[in-house]
Interface confidence: low
């Protein structure tokens, strides 16, 4: 999906006023410093595409994040703001039903919202222009 | 614990430059913004400009036209604020201040403990 | 630019009085920021996003107001609360009221 369109506004509010605060929760008791930061984003397109990728694309050792409250909120503000985003994500959602697990908060799962979270921050703030 | 420790005073005579640092820590020092904002005797608080550490992009107050120029050492986790042609009236208490991005309008959440500019001939 | 005037210069109260500052801007801004500076120290943040309380801060500091005009209260002057606060907006540029120096009567 090609994010361009976005409005971008838009997905910073739902950020700032939910997704945020679920983020802190789901890595409530973890140092800040405890993992490093190793995934970046050039602008607002790439930074939702690489949140998009972390959220929702399950990975060696974290399989569960879509189900979480900050992946739901996240896929309704890309659903309502991304123009065509929901039709994309059907088939995609279908599948995601079937091979889910149990619910299982692995170190895997914390290091990768913790990186979720570099990204948002960084889709929160364009970078200035150099001069 | 982040902190942001600034270099000391300084004395120059008019005319010089000036360059003052600002080091980080406890943070991850490319994640924020940093500003410098400077405040001369009585008077209000004054932004100067500001640096992403992430690619170097600045922004200046365009009072200072030109005389201002901020810089960042990503390896030392350092931001710069150099003013050159300096005057009297540039005689200030010289903060970095770190601009969190968890706050919608981006707060200056952390600020150095300030450096004395003395301008005089 | 956006310039923001506060009011009064100085306000002359109590302990245990109710403390009620202005701050003004020349045009519509989204959200006002509030620090307090006492002499010989840095700027420390009271209040992020009109509302919101910095971390630490205690309950009787809170913020209101919304496109030009903003409030800072403070419910009950405590002996420390007596120094200089600040709003700031963020546009392109960011700026500073005049300030207001809380001193005490």
């Known amino acids: 999906y090609d994010f361009t369109n976005c409005d971008f506004e838009k997905i910073k509010a739902a950020y700032l006023s939910t997704i945020s605060k679920d983020l802190i929760t789901y890595m409530s008791g973890t140092k800040s410093t405890e993992f490093n930061n190793t995934v970046s984003c050039s602008n607002r397109p790439h930074c939702l595409t690489e949140i998009q990728s972390l959220t929702f694309n399950p990975t060696a050792g974290c399989a569960s994040l879509a189900k979480e409250m900050f992946a739901m909120k996240t896929k309704a503000a890309l659903a309502i703001w991304c123009p065509g985003y929901s039709e994309t994500q059907i088939n995609a959602t279908q599948a995601m039903k079937k091979r889910r697990k149990r619910k299982v908060t692995t170190n895997k799962c914390l290091e990768q919202v913790s990186q979720l979270q570099g990204l948002w921050r960084r889709f929160n703030r364009p970078l200035l222009k150099q001069q | 614990e982040v902190q942001l420790v600034q270099s000391g005073a300084e004395v120059k005579k008019p005319g010089a430059s000036v360059k003052v640092s600002c080091k980080a820590s406890g943070y991850t020092f490319t994640d924020d913004y940093m500003n410098w904002v400077r405040q001369a005797p009585g008077q209000r608080l004054e932004w100067m400009g500001i640096i992403s550490p992430y690619n170097g992009g600045t922004s200046y107050n365009q009072k200072f036209k030109g005389r201002v120029t901020i810089t960042r050492d990503t390896s030392a986790s350092t931001a710069y604020m150099e003013l050159s042609s300096l005057r009297s009236e540039d005689t200030a208490v010289y903060y970095c201040?770190?601009?969190?991005?968890?706050?919608?309008?981006?707060?200056?959440?952390?600020w150095g403990q300030g450096t004395t500019v003395t301008v005089s001939s | 630019e956006i310039v923001l005037t506060q009011s009064p210069a100085t306000l002359s109260l109590s302990p245990g009085e109710r403390a009620t500052l202005s701050c003004r801007a020349s045009?519509?801004?989204?959200?006002m920021h509030w620090y307090q500076q006492k002499p010989g120290q840095a700027p420390r943040p009271l209040i992020y996003?009109?509302?919101n309380l910095a971390s630490g801060i205690p309950a009787r500091f809170s913020g209101s107001g919304s496109g030009t005009d903003y409030t800072l209260t403070i419910s009950r002057l405590e002996p420390e609360d007596f120094a200089v606060y600040y709003c700031q907006q963020w546009s392109s540029n960011r700026t500073f009221g005049g300030g207001t120096k809380v001193e005490i009567k």
């Open positions: 996003a009109t509302s």
């Open positions: 201040a770190r601009e969190d991005y968890d706050y919608d309008g981006y707060a200056m959440d952390h």
């Open positions: 045009s519509s801004v989204s959200y």
